[in-house]
């Protein structure tokens, strides 16, 4: 008879999860020679150890500390790019601007990007049927706690001028409940971070409003300023042109505003 298994509201662990994490780790260490020392088997063992055999609504940041230690990486000052609700454009940007880094350009973020995982209490099995949903089941689930943990660490280690890409098409351009708003903003270190520069990405072609005046951006400015970090904001009216100009800065059309 099949074992009884807890039914959660979210989708189950991504198929071939262990193989995918190991493969991504191997690939990352090949592409980034400075990370060649990383033992991917140990990385997987630490990842697995964070959630296997544990009740998936009772995961803590402490559970991920062995993994975080193995994946220690530093980003040069002025090269950190945070994002909120606009992941694809942020990643397209760092694919072109290779000297800037989102969390998903770092080993741990790269390993877990777009994956789902969870285990079950007291068994060594991975649950491929369902995993806890953040809203419907619990917030202390393996995936949410992972991203909270690595996002906190990513923000804590940032230095110089930190950039953040925000989605100007959302009703809340800055959302206090997003990972950026609830974790990263509060873990930037004022003694290391001189400024936060927000890039507000416009959605519509004819949208010429100054979204830097949006009330939620003013709220972000207030939070950042209170933390003794300077705040700047830029409108990116044409994201397609913006990316094109990152690729080809000498293009004559790039001398005008984007």
């Amino acid at each position: 008879l099949p074992r009884w298994r807890q039914q959660w509201s979210g989708s189950g662990t991504t198929s071939r999860f262990p193989e995918t994490v190991l493969a991504r780790c191997v690939k990352y260490t090949e592409v980034h020679p400075e990370m060649r020392h990383v033992d991917c088997q140990s990385v997987w063992d630490a990842f697995k150890g964070a959630f296997i055999s544990k009740y998936p609504c009772n995961i803590t940041e402490e559970d991920y500390q062995p993994l975080v230690k193995l994946g220690t990486q530093t980003v040069p000052c002025n090269k950190t790019l945070l994002w909120s609700r606009i992941k694809d454009l942020a990643h397209q940007f760092t694919q072109v601007q290779r000297d800037m880094f989102t969390l998903e350009d770092m080993l741990l973020g790269y390993l877990a990007d777009d994956l789902t995982w969870c285990g079950e209490f007291n068994t060594f099995e991975i649950n491929y049927q369902s995993c806890p949903d953040w809203r419907k089941d619990c917030s202390n689930n393996p995936v949410s706690v992972f991203w909270k943990t690595v996002s906190r660490r990513f923000a804590e280690t940032a230095c110089g001028v930190v950039h953040v890409m925000l989605n100007g098409s959302r009703s809340k351009i800055f959302d206090k409940n997003s990972t950026f708003g609830s974790v990263e903003v509060h873990n930037l270190q004022p003694e290391k971070v001189q400024a936060l520069e927000a890039w507000v990405i416009h959605g519509g072609r004819e949208d010429s409003r100054d979204l830097c005046q949006d009330p939620t951006i003013k709220e972000l400015e207030s939070i950042i300023s209170k933390r003794n970090i300077r705040f700047f904001c830029k409108n990116i009216y044409r994201p397609d042109k913006f990316l094109q100009c990152v690729k080809n800065p000498e293009d004559s059309s790039c001398l005008s505003g984007i």
């Epitope: 995918t20 592409v31 020392h37």
Partner: antibody, heavy 117, light 113 residues
Framework: EVQLQQSGAEFVRPGASVKLSCTAS????????MHWVKQRPEQGLEWIGW????????KYAPKFQDEATLTADTSSNTAYLHLSSLTSEDTAIYYC??????????WGQGTLVTVSA | DIVMTQSPSSLSVSAGEKVTMSCKSS????????????LAWYQQKPGQPPKLLIY???TRESGVPDRFTGSGSGTDFTLTISSVQAEDLAVYYC?????????FGGGTKLEIK
């Protein structure tokens, strides 16, 4: 189960070009680098280079920089090796391979390319 | 490029005998970050692709018989077959897995008397 299935043998004239394929199963090629290795008759192994199918970034051994072109199609989970201006020196078995942990743990069966007038 | 030199180029032994083959690299394959050697050994039987035997200079790939042992560090490495079997007839290659471009040794051809 991880498998790398390569295209069939090619017999080509000098100066012509050829495109070899390597179709992966059991894993998503976006999550790995796809490597190619050359083995001339009765000789050793030479690493040609790799492609990252996720972003089409490539790395070549200096010797093959101008001789080989690596591409990939993620929709069909296939990597390609394009060889142009072929000479008798290009007569060889070409393998696609995938590293896992350390070392090339998975290999295709190889494609024999014969260049002859 | 790191040059990999294997010796002997061929050897002939009787079944049950112990065999050792050498591989020398022109630069150290020791990773200073983790003190591990990035060297792999492969076995290639006639008409087949190479098969990974050993990685990290001494770690046996799963499914590889324990008569195969890898040892060495830095620039000098050895593959030992403790008791050669008839099915071990093959060419054995070492590979620099440390830095680009990856390079292979010229191979050691093992023949069974």
């Amino acid at each position: 189960e991880v498998q790398l299935q390569q295209s069939g043998a090619e017999f080509v004239r000098p100066g012509a070009s050829v495109k070899l394929s390597c179709t992966a199963s059991g894993f998503n090629i976006k999550d790995s680098l796809m490597h190619w290795v050359k083995q001339r008759p009765e000789q050793g192994l030479e690493w040609i280079g790799w492609i990252d199918p996720e972003d089409d970034k490539t790395k070549y051994a200096p010797k093959f920089q101008d001789e080989a072109t690596l591409t990939a199609d993620t929709s069909s989970n296939t990597a390609y090796l394009h060889l142009s201006s072929l000479t008798s020196e290009d007569t060889a078995i070409y393998y696609c391979a995938r590293r896992f942990l350390r070392g090339f743990a998975y290999w295709g069966q190889g494609t024999l390319v014969t260049v002859s007038a | 490029d790191i040059v990999m030199t294997q010796s002997p180029s061929s050897l002939s032994v009787s079944a049950g005998e112990k065999v050792t083959m050498s591989c020398k690299s022109s630069q150290s394959l020791l990773n200073s970050g983790n003190q591990k050697n990035y060297l792999a050994w492969y076995q290639q039987k006639p008409g087949q692709p190479p098969k990974l035997l050993i990685y990290g200079a001494s770690t046996r790939e799963s499914g590889v018989p324990d008569r195969f042992t890898g040892s060495g560090s830095g620039t000098d490495f050895t593959l030992t077959i403790s008791s050669v079997q008839a099915e071990d007839l093959a060419v054995y290659y070492c590979q620099n897995d440390h830095s680009y471009p990856y390079t292979f040794g010229g191979g050691t051809k093992l023949e069974i008397k």
